[in-house]
């Protein structure tokens, strides 16, 4: 199977690496743009240079293109406690990440909260916290794991998970049913 | 086709509890992060509480913080909201919601149901 190309892949894979075909002449092959910069107009003729200026503030290009524009940098979350790890220039983006003892929880691939690291009180610590991974604790006799903290077995309730981690704590528990509560 | 069902809402008393689930098909629901979001009546969408994919990352807004529980069974295809000390201005239709893949925030969801009414009144 041969895999499907977009047009300006089908335009640029006619041109030797680091160039790509004229918008209107196909047999003109332009220089591509440095990173931190972007086009403006493409060559004239063959073995012309292509017109790139550089990115207004504001605003980057990562790699080699022939962007009619360059990309808005990013802009680092702050609800969801994310910090400037390094500022936006014209050849890269805006790097953000997590203040000391946190780690990052990906939502999705482009959004990630920070989240304090667990301290695996009642419990000691199994993994420790990474920058994209909690701690992982291992919890003392008479406590249970629930969202990565150790919770004491008199609040297990019969129906949840932790009924087979706190086996000979559960018939003293007085709740029967779980309601949902934590 | 992916769809989403809620159940659960109804009238409740101030002060009152109520379990919301939402029954997932038509995609690997284990995969997703999934959330709830709902629309008082006048109002825009709010979001209330997302959990990942695995069910051990929660957040909740904190209008909701202390009082609403998200959860999820992987192995039944649902998602729940456990809702308790319930308010007037938690009137709402509640939405379980499905976040996108390359979401930049929590309303950038792809599916969404048809909605539960709560409404919390004496």
């Known amino acids: 199977l041969v895999p499907h190309l977009g047009d300006r892949e089908k335009r640029d894979s006619v041109c030797p690496q680091g160039k790509y075909i004229h918008p209107q002449n196909n047999s003109i092959c332009c220089t591509k743009c440095h990173k931190g910069t972007y086009l403006y107009n493409d060559c004239p003729g063959p073995g012309q240079d292509t017109d790139c200026r550089e990115c207004e503030s504001g605003s980057f290009t990562a790699s080699e293109n022939h962007l009619r524009h360059c990309l808005s940098c990013s802009k680092c979350r702050k609800e969801m406690g994310q910090v400037e790890i390094s500022s936006c220039t014209v050849d890269r983006d805006t790097v953000c990440g997590c203040r000391k003892n946190q780690y990052r929880h990906y939502w999705s691939e482009n959004l990630f909260q920070c989240f304090n690291c667990s301290l695996c009180l009642n419990g000691t610590v199994h993994l420790s916290c990474q920058e994209k991974q909690n701690t992982v604790c291992t919890c003392h006799a008479g406590f249970f794991l629930r969202e990565n903290e150790c919770v004491s077995c008199s609040n297990c309730k019969k129906s949840l998970e932790c009924t087979k981690l706190c086996l000979p704590q559960i018939e003293n528990v007085k709740g029967t049913e779980d309601s949902g509560t934590t | 086709e992916v769809q989403l069902l809620e159940s659960g809402g109804g009238l409740v008393q101030p002060g009152g509890s109520l379990r919301l689930s939402c029954a997932a098909s038509?995609?690997?629901?284990?995969?997703?992060?999934m959330l709830w979001v709902r629309q008082a009546p006048g109002k825009g969408l709010e979001w209330v509480s997302v959990?990942?994919?695995?069910?051990?990352?929660?957040y909740y807004a904190d209008s909701v913080k202390g009082r609403f529980t998200i959860s999820r069974d992987n192995s039944k295809n649902t998602l729940y909201l456990q809702m308790n000390s319930l308010r007037a201005e938690d009137t709402a239709v509640y939405y379980c919601?499905?976040?996108?893949?390359?979401?930049?925030?929590?309303?950038?969801?792809?599916?969404w149901g048809q909605g539960t009414l709560v409404t919390v009144s004496s």
């Open positions: 959990i990942s994919a695995e069910g051990r990352t929660t």
């Open positions: 038509g995609f690997t629901f284990a995969n997703y992060t």
């Open positions: 919601a499905k976040l996108n893949m390359k979401a930049t925030n929590f309303k950038d969801f792809d599916y």
